[in-house]
Interface confidence: low
């Protein structure tokens, strides 16, 4: 059965700075990532593979990442209020077959203790 | 509404084995990972063992290397654990996880699933 809150953890934060998890089924080859902040595109990042199966990795608006074969994780350093706000993961996919993913989104809260450099 | 459902577990005597069963059912557009996890009395959830979609082994707690085998039918979108040799101190209440993507209309939303657990109790 499913699990009350069953969505996995979207943002972890460390070190001042805050990483979002952005999953996708991975059964897929070759697609678009982008993290969106309210509605606009903070970082993207395209996946897709060529002959001999290179992989090639390319990012539009560019964000620290970090890729795995399930996940694109994007992040933020250097955290203050200006940051919190609504994220969602936006996928595209261009194989297998192409289709639009929404991955389901959150609200990133940011209180004193996950800022970069409080004043003590 | 997707569903995890279990069997296979029960009372069994020291070196003997069982199989679990985890089949997943209902809107399912695609699994990531499935894993066994279990819990025994005053314990935390642990990880017995874990697959990717594509079927390699990503782990195996050391406590079951050699005995437990994690297996899986991606056609029936159901995993496996095969439990030889068991030990008393596996007795445990065992659940399986999977890493599940469901469709609403054009979306599709990665979600973790639970089933509900099944006990398994190792004694002469």
């Known amino acids: 059965e499913i699990n009350g809150s069953a969505n996995y953890e979207m943002f972890i934060f460390h070190n001042g700075g805050v990483q979002i998890l952005c999953k996708y089924p991975d059964i897929v080859q070759q697609f678009k990532m982008q993290l969106l902040k309210g509605g606009q595109i903070l970082c993207d990042l395209t996946k897709t593979k060529g002959s001999g199966n290179t992989v090639s990795i390319k990012s539009l608006k560019f964000c620290h990442s970090q890729l795995s074969n399930n996940s694109v994780s994007f992040f933020l350093y250097n955290l203050d209020h200006s940051h919190a706000n609504y994220y969602f993961c936006n996928l595209s996919i261009f194989d297998p077959p192409p289709f639009k993913v929404t991955l389901t989104g959150g609200y990133l809260h940011i209180y004193e203790s996950q800022l970069c450099c409080q004043l003590k | 509404q997707v569903q995890l459902q279990q069997s296979g577990g029960g009372l069994v005597q020291p070196g003997g084995s069982l199989r679990l069963s985890c089949a997943a059912s209902g809107s399912i557009f695609s699994i990531n990972g499935m894993g066994w996890y279990r819990q025994a009395p005053g314990k935390e959830r642990e990880l017995v063992a874990g697959?990717?979609?594509?079927?390699?082994?990503?782990n195996y707690a050391d406590s079951v290397k050699g005995r437990f085998t994690i297996s899986r039918d991606n056609a029936k979108n159901t995993v496996y654990l095969q439990m030889n040799s068991l030990k008393p101190e596996d007795t445990a209440v065992y659940y399986c996880?999977?890493?599940?993507?469901?469709?609403?209309?054009?979306?599709?939303?990665?979600?973790?699933?639970w089933g509900k657990g099944t006990q398994v109790t190792v004694k002469p």
């Open positions: 996880r999977a890493e599940i993507f469901t469709r609403t209309g054009e979306n599709y939303y990665g979600m973790d699933y």
């Open positions: 697959l990717t979609s594509g079927g390699s082994v990503t």
